[in-house]
Interface confidence: low
């Protein structure tokens, strides 16, 4: 009588993550007696999958009813795949024996290889904001993908960037891969509303690619321009000054005014306009009572913009002369003062 | 002796999200699952997910797809469940749990070590 | 996701009495069925795991069986220290749920 032999008909196999693989094996006869056992991985170190005679396997199912009598079909469906599942699993035919089972003959082996979607990409900024004309480092990482084979792009606002750097881990063979990506983008003043977007195509997403992004807004700061300006006399011994500071992010500025180096008022932006770009105006006037003055009156707008250093910029009144006849911005300087303001 | 100790009581806010911490000791950390489950005042028992300590993977239950984040830091043998956009009706007890296992077994037997439950509360 | 029909939602009866509590599966879950036990403040105590395998240190008045989809909970004998909660749970598809629960108390 011919001897029994297990038959594994493919290869290999290849199924997606989350979906259920079919391992097949038939044996060509129904001597010796003995269960069926699936392993996984060959030799001393292999894993059990699944035992006919014993044990619980809830991922497991046999295609056949493997307690009717002349079956000859071993083949198992394991549910929910994860790329952890991936190696060559072999269909093995014991033998009964007093007091184990003897192994008798193994199939040729079945290769699994999962299909694993990348996770969805997740970009990262730099810590601090930094202004524009620098460069700064955007990341973008994706896990758990399989095969190795992967593609990442970036953009910026829809174009694509060439200045970035990506790795896949591991180098060698691994159950799942990992991506990460660093790219240089060189900020702008309009960059506010600007978004970088790290793009990750890989065979299981079917041509419709991961995306993920970042808000540049979470990024750049764009120092404010200040210009002080006199305005036409409102009482016979009073000049408005204003301080127009100009396309500055984030909101978060304070302003202090100064007359003759004396700390006369400070407030803190609150009704702002917004700008088309996203930067923001903010304009604050000081009310001089010239008669109060003997001497020229120095007057300046000192800015603290996001934390930075304050920046100044100043304006003399001429108190000698009549107000009426006084000229707007006679002498200005922008100090760009160190000093922080203790308020 | 094998036990999982979890952080202590929360108050929130509604749409605020709150990070709960569970501490294993007395077993190898990376060789049993963890899931969590939560239970509402006077409620059933709510599986929430389930992490595998080793590789970090992850299975959440579909209620709490978007919202809940599971993971784990192995220096430390500590899970963490994070649960974000909190409602009123997140207010319940958070408990940690342990899948023991035996042979080849996909998803464990069950879960044979649970932590002591921290009390999650959200109101305005 | 596998609905877990336990009935019944609470239950009194006298010390050393027979005392039983069902559980249904919407679909076949083999023996992958789990049963715990949770006393008022408490977390929840695995009692019987796989149907009917009684967890180390466990009572041997607390029983499980297994038919089809159907699944029985049985303390032989009800004794004080069994005031609680009892909950079924299966544990072969994620996720794994949970019945409703079954409050007993004694009369």
């Known amino acids: 009588e011919e001897e029994l032999q297990v038959i594994q008909p493919d290869k290999s196999v290849l199924v997606a993550a989350g979906e259920t693989a079919t391992l097949r094996c038939t044996a060509t006869s129904l001597i010796p007696v003995g269960p069926i056992q699936w392993f996984r991985g060959a030799g001393p170190g292999r894993e059990l999958i699944y035992n006919q005679k014993e044990g619980h396997f809830p991922r497991v199912t046999t295609v056949s009813d493997l307690t009717k009598r002349n079956n000859m079909d071993f083949s198992i469906r394991i549910g929910n795949i994860t790329p952890a599942d991936a190696g060559t699993y072999y269909c093995v035919k014991f033998r009964k024996g007093s007091p184990d089972d003897v192994e008798f003959k193994s199939g040729a082996g079945t290769e699994l290889s999962v299909r694993a979607k990348p996770s969805a990409p997740v970009v990262s900024g730099p810590a601090a904001r930094a202004t524009p004309q620098h460069t700064v480092s955007f990341t973008c990482e994706s896990h758990g993908f399989s095969p190795r084979d992967i593609t990442l792009k970036w953009f910026k606002n829809g174009n694509e960037l060439s200045d970035f750097q990506t790795n896949v881990d591991p180098v060698g063979e691994s159950v799942s891969y990992s991506i990460h990506s660093t790219a240089k983008v060189v900020l702008t003043r309009e960059d506010v509303h600007s978004q970088v977007i790290c793009e990750v195509a890989h065979v299981t997403l079917q041509g419709d690619p991961l995306r993920g992004t970042a808000n540049l807004s979470e990024t750049i700061r764009v120092p404010p321009t200040l210009e002080v300006t006199q305005q036409p006399v409102r009482a016979e011994n009073q000049v408005n000054v204003t301080c127009q500071v100009r396309k500055f992010y984030p909101q978060r500025l304070q302003l202090t005014w100064l007359e003759n180096g004396n700390v006369s008022r400070t407030e803190t932006a609150s009704t702002v306009t917004e700008n088309k770009d996203g930067t923001y105006n903010w304009m604050s006037w000081l009310l001089v009572n010239v008669s109060a003055h003997r001497d020229d009156v120095k007057l300046t707008c000192q800015v603290e913009h996001d934390g930075q250093p304050a920046v100044s910029k100043s304006h003399d009144l001429k108190v000698s002369a009549h107000p009426k006849e006084q000229g707007s911005n006679t002498a200005a300087e922008n100090t760009g003062s160190n000093e922080r303001n203790i308020y | 002796q094998v036990q999982l100790v979890q952080s202590g009581a929360e108050v929130k806010k509604p749409g605020a999200s709150v990070k709960v911490s569970c501490k294993a000791s007395g077993y190898t950390f990376t060789s049993y699952y963890m899931v969590w489950v939560r239970q509402a005042p006077g409620q059933g028992l709510e599986w929430m997910g389930i992490?595998?300590?080793?590789?970090?993977?992850?299975s959440y239950a579909q209620k709490f797809q978007g919202r809940v984040t599971m993971t784990r830091d192995t220096s430390t043998s500590t899970v963490y469940m994070e649960l974000s956009s909190l409602r009123s009706e997140d207010t319940a007890v958070y408990y940690c749990?342990?899948?023991?296992?035996?042979?080849?077994?996909?998803?464990?037997?069950?879960?044979?070590?649970w932590g002591q439950g921290t009390t999650v509360t959200v109101s305005s | 996701d596998i609905q877990m029909t336990q009935s019944p939602s609470s239950l009194s009866a006298s010390v050393g009495d027979r005392v039983t509590i069902t559980c249904q599966a919407s679909q076949d879950i083999s023996n992958s069925l789990n049963w715990y036990q949770q006393k008022p403040g408490k977390a929840p105590k695995l009692l019987i795991y796989d149907a009917s395998n009684l967890e180390t240190g466990v009572p041997s008045r607390f029983s499980g069986s297994r038919s089809g989809t159907d699944f029985t909970f049985t303390i032989s004998s009800l004794q004080p220290e069994d005031i609680a909660t009892y909950y079924c749970q299966q544990v072969i598809i994620l996720p794994l749920t949970f019945g409703g629960g079954t409050k007993v108390e004694i009369k």
């Open positions: 992490i595998n300590p080793s590789g970090g993977s992850t």
């Open positions: 749990a342990r899948e023991g296992g035996y042979g080849y077994r996909a998803y464990p037997y069950g879960m044979d070590v």
